[in-house]
Interface confidence: low
Amino acid sequence: SEGRKTWRRRGQQPPPPPRTEAAPAAGQPVESFPLDFTAVEGNMDSFMAQVKSLAQSLYPCSAQQLNEDLRLHLLLNTSVTCNDGSPAGYYLKESRGSRRWLLFLEGGWYCFNRENCDSRYDTMRRLMSSRDWPRTRTGTGILSSQPEENPYWWNANMVFIPYCSSDVWSGASSKSEKNEYAFMGALIIQEVVRELLGRGLSGAKVLLLAGSSAGGTGVLLNVDRVAEQLEKLGYPAIQVRGLADSGWFLDNKQYRHTDCVDTITCAPTEAIRRGIRYWNGVVPERCRRQFQEGEEWNCFFGYKVYPTLRCPVFVVQWLFDEAQLTVDNVHLTGQPVQEGLRLYIQNLGRELRHTLKDVPASFAPACLSHEIIIRSHWTDVQVKGTSLPRALHCWDRSLHDSHKASKTPLKGCPVHLVDSCPWPHCNPSCPTVRDQFTGQEMNVAQFLMHMGFDMQTVAQPQGLEPSELLGMLSNGS
């Protein structure tokens, strides 16, 4: 999927929303506080400019900017391992003045039987073993400590947890004579949290468990368990929240049914059904109780597990997610798309939009893409004029204000942002589409025609002539 797009940051970014963390006094961490905007609503631009100016003038004082890297720490408890028995671990960049912790779960599909796990080990060993992990990683997107790249949480303690368990972060089985591979995704998260408590997490105010793709699904499967773990360990004051990016999948009917041969072609329900048994997978307790024994696979699907979660979760999902299309056996080759497939793709967007109807905190652009939050240009995409960092900032504010009785959304600060336009790339801020084979940029008109969209059909609801639409899309791509 990577080959189909190019993402570039604009050379410049809109000003970041105001930081909500105070500078630490005399070396000790200070509580972060929300800003009350009511007094400045009349002259917000001027106020924001002042805050930005202040942030920029203070930023050089921070020693953090000297090293952008997150440093690798292999788990001290070496019995919590990757698939091949090597110790799992995490990359950490501390921000001592901050009481926010961001734990990011990496994605990367899964394997669900001996055969496709062997194949994965041959071709993608980094996702099954820690043996060749680099000692440092650069934080990008939401993991960046640069305010320009990460206007949302640039000052947080950043933790990147590499995915090396191939189990959608759900497994709880160790390597043994019987088991060629360990699947310990759920246990890795628990162990990382335990070790981080000794590295400053114990003083956290907010822990945001985030993840992309399989990591996004991992967030849905583990966020409540992390909250429960911290409560049991004596840290009930740490607010645990989730941010699930590109992990909200549908167990819909495949475009073309194929036998469950490999990870990519196997229908998601069947892959997960087999996987849970192979991994000894665990799902959130409240969700598990809603389904019969053997039906736990249901809890891997966002729209089924979400209503059972206690922690607040923000869902980020492209309406036309490439991984979803892949498991649905939709492969956009060089050939123009037939009408049946076009309708299937449009219907997928409609279904996904429907599943997000009751998710108050969500960001779903009508784009064909996959993953966003750790891409450098994650600030570029907007839904109805609001960027993702801005929506997350509004979410933070809404959670802070939620002890007040009002459930109404904050004025001018939306958190439910789901595109309503009906075809892929109808949002002008979508990332550039590239031809899967030639790598050439396709303008939106080319892309839509390639996908078999009849320009008359697309133009009509917009009150346009097809020729006008083509011109507009070619120019606005």
Epitope: T6, R8, R10, G11, Q12, D380, Q382, V383, K384, G385, D419, S420, C421, C426, N427, P428, S429, C430, P431, T432, T438, Q440, E441, M442, N443, Q446, Q462, G463, L464, E468, L469, G471, M472, S474, N475, G476, S477
Partner: antibody, heavy 119, light 111 residues
Amino acid sequence: EVQLVESGGGLVKPGGSLKLSCAASGFTFSDYGMHWFRQAPEKGLEWVAYISSGSRTVYYADTVKGRFTISRDNAKNTLSLQMTSLRSEDTAMYYCARKHYNGGYFDVWGTGTTVTVSS
Amino acid sequence: DIVLTQSPASLAVSLGQRATISCRASKIVSTSGYSYMHWYQQKPGQPPKLLIYLASNLESGVPARFSGSGSGTDFTLNIHPVEEEDAATYYCQHSRELPPTFGSGTKLEIK
């Protein structure tokens, strides 16, 4: 630093030809659609031509169609505008500009090169 | 082609006051929640500089005293408080279809 620098302008007789160039630096040129604009003395801005990032798509203003040709060389980070059958009304400052990858706005402009068509 | 009518053609505003420039399109330039209207500033001898994109988004590096609003056919650029350096000609531009056209410009003078 993101930069566009035009060159190739000058004085030319009506019916003559001229080739303008635009050298790009500081960004991945091959990722962006590029445009030419012009501005006659004391007048407003007029769009001239567009070329997509991979040269697949080109568009021209009606006033220049058949006389001007836009092209690009991504290996050399260069945009060109070949102008033939020049007329006095083509006299203007010519700018190249980078189209932001979405939304159809122009976030980087060159400093311009002057074309004067006069006998 | 979509015609953009800018008004006024020129205006003089005192330092610290508000300048308001309007741009009306001959056809709707908004669709699916997005408005394809952008604003530029041009000073003599210089190329245009992007100020506002997609109607209301402030380009990075542009002072927060600039703001854009509007949808459909009617759009506004506001500058408040006006500063000396804001003396320039301002253009609106649409990208709803090809060709992208510009307004005729508004010359802002600081009193």
